[in-house]
Amino acid sequence: EVEKTACPSGKKAREIDESLIFYKKWELEACVDAALLATQMDRVNAIPFTYEQLDVLKHKLDELYPQGYPESVIQHLGYLFLKMSPEDIRKWNVTSLETLKALLEVNKGHEMSPQVATLIDRFVKGRGQLDKDTLDTLTAFYPGYLCSLSPEELSSVPPSSIWAVRPQDLDTCDPRQLDVLYPKARLAFQNMNGSEYFVKIQSFLGGAPTEDLKALSQQNVSMDLATFMKLRTDAVLPLTVAEVQKLLGPHVEGLKAEERHRPVRDWILRQRQDDLDTLGLGLQGGIPNGYLVLDLSMQEALS
């Protein structure tokens, strides 16, 4: 902490300008009025202050606003935002999307820092849900943002926000996250026609149940293997050879290259070998011909 010293004669700052970069730390503390700093925060970003000088400016704002900065100051923090701790940010009440964008811009190109994570958390909680504009903004800065949320947090995403989601935003989502997002996407895109619907829903299909995959198999969608490999194993297992053939269309030939991988290998084990042979792909490991296999799904449900 900088000790209190009187401002030398003639050095009292009347505005925030470049002359301040020549001030020593104690001079900044003594000669810059915190209220002046707060009203002219937008100028700080244009001045090449050292990290040590920024520490002094932060200290002055902390003294002026011990309960947390007002949004008028937060919006113009610029690089001073990088000096904030998550504890500082938890005191803020950020409601403007413009403020959020301004602060995210400062951190652009870097990994999501604890400060940014806290800021986003405060902003989203303040809004009560992850609306489309917010999601649009966050995924623009952090494509992996959506997949960093827990399934519980994702449950607050309204279906209308799903329109803002791009395929790359879902790249790192795990099955439990897609389980939450898929029903929302299904609802959001429900009024689209067949081929357009498939284009939109495709990225979310890792959360689709068996009955929806069966329905898609009747619509000539020609699902690619990359999408098929991301489907829930338990959703794929009940599909028949004919249904998988219809679902994949010309891409069915790709099953051979994936026969050792999930969910393909699990699905193969549950198909009759003579049904697999009808595909002409040389898939092996199905139920040997002549075996009598009972449907045990009811037995398992009861046990």
Epitope: T233, D234, R260, L269, E300
Partner: antibody
Amino acid sequence: QVQLQESGPGLVKPSETLSLTCTVSGGSVSSGSYYWSWIRQPPGKGLEWIGYIYYSGSTNYNPSLKSRVTISVDTSKNQFSLKLSSVTAADTAVYYCARDHYERGLYWGQGTLVTVSS
Amino acid sequence: DIQMTQSPSSLSASVGDRVTITCRASQSISSYLNWYQQKPGKAPKLLIYAASSLQSGVPSRFSGSGSGTDFTLTISSLQPEDFATYYCQQSYSTPLTFGGGTKVEIK
């Protein structure tokens, strides 16, 4: 709670066939949710997957052992078995049977040590 | 075959320490990764399945994270009964493969 118990000879001569059986209690090998696996661990070393069988008789073996391995299932006895032919000293290991759920990992038997020696 | 590389191969820690073990797959395995604990003379015991799901009955000090090729097992506060060898295992592709193990010893 399901229990798996390995049984079979603890000593096998080189070039002979190792035979082990795993008896499942408290659950059924006919369950459609599980594969029934064999895994081994040479003394002081890591774990090696041998293969698994599904109740229908479908099998999947480790390519490195495929030519010597046969896994079978007997649903009437609630057992599954391992046969490993042409054994050498390198096959000396603790052999584990395990239940493999397709998304929930392996639940293991206690294991049985098989020594290959003349 | 998918190679699983665990690090470190051994570590010394004290009761109460936070311990992190990493596992790297030679290609993407999505979330198909399990963690096991093995004590001398005993069978491995499942701790974590599907990369981050805690097996029933396993203490909450164990947690798993990761997706694709890089995975982590964390013990938040090491207890005396946690000194053991830990293995990761991929279940995405056959042959199923295991990491070489990480032995956690008392410092």
